[in-house]
Amino acid sequence: QRFAQAQQQLPLESLGWDVAELQLNHTGPQQDPRLYWQGGPALGRSFLHGPELDKGQLRIHRDGIYMVHIQVTLAICSSTTASRHHPTTLAVGICSPASRSISLLRLSFHQGCTIASQRLTPLARGDTLCTNLTGTLLPSRNTDETFFGVQWVRP
Amino acid sequence: QRFAQAQQQLPLESLGWDVAELQLNHTGPQQDPRLYWQGGPALGRSFLHGPELDKGQLRIHRDGIYMVHIQVTLAICSSTTASRHHPTTLAVGICSPASRSISLLRLSFHQGCTIASQRLTPLARGDTLCTNLTGTLLPSRNTDETFFGVQWVRP
Amino acid sequence: QRFAQAQQQLPLESLGWDVAELQLNHTGPQQDPRLYWQGGPALGRSFLHGPELDKGQLRIHRDGIYMVHIQVTLAICSSTTASRHHPTTLAVGICSPASRSISLLRLSFHQGCTIASQRLTPLARGDTLCTNLTGTLLPSRNTDETFFGVQWVRP
């Protein structure tokens, strides 16, 4: 019983429960394939508890293994649109620091209009995650169709 | 060592580990797009630890941020079936209380026969989640093809 | 404060934080549909903390409910390739002990070149998970396109 009380009094941050769920803010200018994200209760159901946004990109604040997940839906899309504009590809990676740059997760749309996936990956404090959408098709900004998030799982 | 023993003696509920994984029970009558779920060890590998079922819909018992995931496979389906019956769409949302009604997750099948996704979202005690499948195609009841679950992640 | 220190001194294993993320090593010989996995920091971003590999298949070391996730991308693939070679199917299941053999997760590629999904499932110490890819198409070995992992969620 004492343990349960102690646990409740501990700040959640000390338990390492960093978590974020973001919604699409906007796409970049023509030569910039990055998606720009936003989060916070004023915007709806998005939030950041631990990680931060740096110019629309997600920056990690705690070392550990994270579950990274994403769903992106194309805004104006049918199976014929998707195949005619192929390849349209979504990649999630560490984009800074440059020394740690790597692609973590990559999917192509082919004849579909939505991609969704998730993976476990080690991330370090200061890692910035970028989500690159290559191709000419635009993503939907609907919050139930396009979202991106991370969840700290263990040290 | 004492801490480890204490932890094991604590009821899991006090740690907030609410979790559920459901299998499809049946679809609704003609004008009802909802999927009706079931869970429990007698049914196979489905279970409810914390959340409850209310007339086949999942009701949350603990406030917090949850990972919600779903996979739905159409029962008699090929890429031509899926495109001919387009749009077939799956939406997961809070359907009650009405004041909190919102779509959390939405995917269309286009030329595919399976959708699968996941997201982090805040849920409150009493929220009921509904999964709406719109269109004329029926979902598979195979437990490895169609399932729906939630996992409490943090307060 | 004492609790936080105690928690940090505890071996993570006692908290039940078993987790693994694997990358594709190779496919099996002609009559063997299994994918063979590998993991470890020397290989990149894959790892095993708790579970072990047994001849390229993942063996569970701790009873509990796990989140199992997978993404498989076909190596030389377009929507026409995928539909021409249909059915290409990926199934994740318990393959040993034989008494517990069951399919946990199943997806077909149809006209897509990537499948990705996740589910919660109870697993027991000694369960070995196999991932069967049926059909003639080969999976990509790119670590951002094909991966398989588990995360212990609760007892």
Partner: nanobody, 116 residues
Amino acid sequence: QVQLQESGGGLVQTGGSLRLSCTASGSIFDIARGNWYRQAPGKQRELVAIITSGGATNYADSVAGRFTISRDSAWKALYLQMNSLKPEDTAVYFCNMETFSYRNYWGQGTQVTVSS
């Protein structure tokens, strides 16, 4: 309350052209995207064209190569140039502006009828 107002609809013969305009009754700040939707009788509302704050555009398959979306620099107006019109383009056309903070502004719609 800001209102959007469409104009430029009407009756036109197959192969003809129309230019739809959409103007705001007040100032809308931080616009992320301008969109044109259409709704034909008995059908769902369909997104036909998008223009982003950065100037990127996308079109539905059914109108690509025939329709062009544009805007003025201050987002005071949104336009849809429709060429080579077909009977299947007959619908009520709605303009929509969405802000970065997820507010949505809609017009009342303008009827476009293409006769054969």
